[in-house]
């Protein structure tokens, strides 16, 4: 029975050219995390495998950094980075848990005027 829940940073915004940390946290379960996949829509960005470490997609290697923890840091943000991101926790023995984050990358002038999403 899957008892765990995924907590995420929810809806977030960041400035173009800046960086952001995508963070998910699995709680309320004793399941062992075998691997976390980070995906943008249907594209695999990176994985963190408990036994084998981090692997970052070559397409994003220059702009994606592993961590902190099981999170993912996106750097040199562009407007095209706006969209949904998913953390997929493969656990034993529970199975798969998925968390969703929506990132909006704003032009720096807009961001300075506080047009930001509220994190729930």
């Amino acid at each position: 029975m899957m008892t765990g829940t995924i907590e995420t940073t929810g809806n977030i915004s960041a400035e173009k050219g800046g960086s952001i940390i995508l963070q998910c946290h699995l709680s309320s379960t004793t399941a062992q995390v075998t691997q976390v996949n980070w995906e943008q829509q249907d594209q695999l960005l990176a994985i963190c495998n408990a036994d084998l470490g981090w692997h970052i997609s070559p397409s994003f290697k220059d702009r994606v950094a592993p961590g902190p923890g099981l999170g993912l840091t996106l750097q040199s943000l562009t407007v095209n980075d706006t969209g949904e991101y998913f953390c997929i926790y493969h656990t034993y023995p529970d199975g798969t848990y998925t968390g969703r984050i929506f990132l909006e990358v704003l032009e720096s002038s807009v961001a300075e005027h506080g047009a930001r999403f509220q994190i729930p």
Epitope: T34, N49, D51, L52, H55, P58, Y92, G95
Partner: antibody, heavy 121, light 110 residues
């Protein structure tokens, strides 16, 4: 349809080399760990090697082949390779290419038909 | 010698239920999911069970898997002549940092 097709097997003398290939189709090749598994005549399955997703910068080997075999991948060609050097009689086997589950530790969900390697003088 | 231990052979008559065991240790079976593979004579292995007890599409529900502690088992009910094959269990071992298989069990349908 997900398919794996091995090639490159054959007869080779002890101490010789051989390069196996595995052409993949029907799935996003770069997003999966891939493995080689072998089966000696009349024997069971033996995992040989695996390679990480994406650029394949991490590789894993059974102790029996460490230092002699090299696994690699070319994502632009959807192809997995196994370079086998310093071959021994005990390397004689059918070699299978296998696609791993999204998580390597969860096993292999698709197998090729195999290619036969015979090491003999 | 294989890291996972399976009986070398098993047999049953058509319609019977047969169970094949697979024994390991904490660094493999206890900590990870177990898969089962079927190898019909002269063919490549095929995934039969993954995630301890999950069947891929196309695998009949006569095949079932289970796991408890450091052991796993494959049960085949309503045995049929076409089930005659070699069966292998497999899992990850985090001490070896390698995938490991059982030695295989040859199932004979009498």
């Amino acid at each position: 349809e997900v398919q794996l097709l091995e090639s490159g097997g054959g007869l080779v003398q002890p101490g010789g080399s051989l390069r196996l290939s595995c052409a993949a189709s029907g799935f996003t090749f770069s997003s999966y760990y891939m493995s080689w598994v072998r089966q000696a005549p009349g024997k069971g399955l033996e995992w040989v090697s695996a390679i990480s997703i994406f650029s394949g910068d991490s590789t894993y080997y059974a102790d029996s082949v460490k230092g002699r075999f090299t696994i690699s991948r070319d994502n632009s060609k959807n192809t997995l390779y196994l370079q086998m050097n310093s071959l021994r009689a005990e390397d004689t086997a059918v070699y299978y290419c296998a696609k791993s589950h999204t998580v390597l530790q969860y096993g292999m969900d698709v197998w090729g038909q195999g290619t036969t390697v015979t090491v003999s003088s | 010698q294989s890291v996972l231990t399976q009986p070398p052979s098993a047999s049953g008559t058509p319609g019977q239920r047969v169970t094949i065991s697979c024994s390991g240790v904490t660094s493999n079976i206890r900590n990870y999911y177990v898969s089962w593979y079927q190898q019909l004579p002269g063919t490549a292995p095929k995934l039969l069970i993954y995630g301890n007890d999950q069947r891929p599409s196309g695998v009949p529900d006569r095949f079932s898997g289970s796991k408890s502690g450091t052991s796993a088992s494959l049960a085949i009910s309503g045995l049929q002549s076409e089930d005659e094959a070699d069966y292998y269990c497999g899992t990850w071992d985090n001490t070896l940092n390698a995938w490991v298989f059982g030695g295989g069990t040859k199932l004979t349908v009498l």
